[in-house]
Interface confidence: low
């Protein structure tokens, strides 16, 4: 009997390991898809940009390294902000490093001052985990400083030099990001 229980437990553990592996594969696949989509989008932009207009970023976008950023002049709720970025062939800003955060906050200070700007960060309703739009988790130093008390869905935004959280249905400016075009020589 004990042997039987032990065998079942081992089988269950094996099944669990397989499921975890599958989940890990899925997460990796999802991330890779998001990256591929960005590269594909950059490739399409490259192909479509004419020889006359080979600047790395469109008009009114700011460049930093291989990214272009658009700081909106109009506000909307988080979901609509994401839609608006998608229409421009971009996504809501995903902050990958402290260097990128410093560039963004420095640029905002010059452009507009201390307003709120949606970024592509939202909180999973079930687990409470913060996730970027490509499914990845922000690095520990880039987690929103305050947990919103809202019972509604919570999303991330940048204000001054902080990453904060708020009800996704509130109105804010937003920042879109896309890959900069490589200049064709």
């Amino acid at each position: 009997k004990l042997l039987q229980v032990s065998t079942i437990a081992m089988q269950q553990q094996e099944k669990l390991i397989q499921q975890e592996r599958a989940l890990l594969n899925f997460t990796e696949w999802k991330r890779s898809c998001a990256l591929q989509m960005k590269y594909c989008q950059a490739f399409m932009q490259n192909s479509l940009s004419s020889a006359h207009n080979s600047s790395p970023c469109p008009n009114n976008w700011i460049q930093n390294r291989e990214s272009c950023y658009y700081v909106s002049e109009i506000w909307s709720i988080w979901h609509t902000s994401q839609e608006n970025c998608l229409k421009e062939g971009s996504t809501l800003l995903q902050i990958e490093s402290k260097e990128e955060m410093d560039f963004i906050t420095g640029s905002l200070r010059k452009i507009k001052g201390s307003y709120d700007y949606w970024v592509g960060l939202s909180q999973d309703g079930h687990s409470g985990r913060w996730l970027w739009q490509d499914g990845s988790s922000p690095s520990p130093g880039l987690l929103p400083a305050e947990r919103s008390q809202s019972a509604n869905q919570v999303c991330g935004y940048v204000k001054s030099n902080s990453l904060l959280s708020s009800n996704c249905s509130t109105w804010k400016y937003f920042i879109c990001e896309k890959y900069a075009l490589r200049s064709s020589v």
Epitope: W75, E83, N84, K87, T170, W171
Partner: nanobody
């Protein structure tokens, strides 16, 4: 349902000023941006300026920035657009609207429109 009633349009010389008003009634406006869009003859309707009713934040289009000023009277539920340094290209029908997003053009309620003509 939100009802919007514009007034104050008219004919003005280039360089002149005009103030148009929009009185809103009906449903609560707290979920909306209320403001102005315009449509010039043969052109698409375009965003001019709007106020986020709950936060009071105001947005202007590039063409309106610096020349037009949006304000509101909470007690009267009325939005005003003060237009200065008017140019012939500002000639259009100006529509008051309540929108759930000004950028994506998701306008939920439109007014009837008021004609603004700027002569050179």
């Amino acid at each position: 349902q939100v009802q919007l009633q514009e007034s104050g349009g008219g004919l003005v010389q280039a360089g002149g000023s005009l103030r148009v008003s929009c009185a809103a009634s009906g449903r609560t406006l707290s979920n909306y941006a209320v403001g102005w869009w315009r449509q010039a003859p043969g052109k698409q309707r375009e965003f001019v300026a709007a106020i986020n009713w709950s936060s009071g934040g105001i947005s202007y289009s590039n063409s309106a920035k610096g020349r037009f000023a949006l304000s509101r009277d909470n007690a009267k539920n009325t939005v005003y657009l003060q237009m200065d340094s008017l140019k012939p290209e500002d000639t259009a029908v100006y529509y008051c609207a309540a929108a759930s997003s000004v950028l994506s053009g998701t306008v939920d309620y439109w007014g009837q429109g008021t004609q603004v003509t700027v002569s050179s």
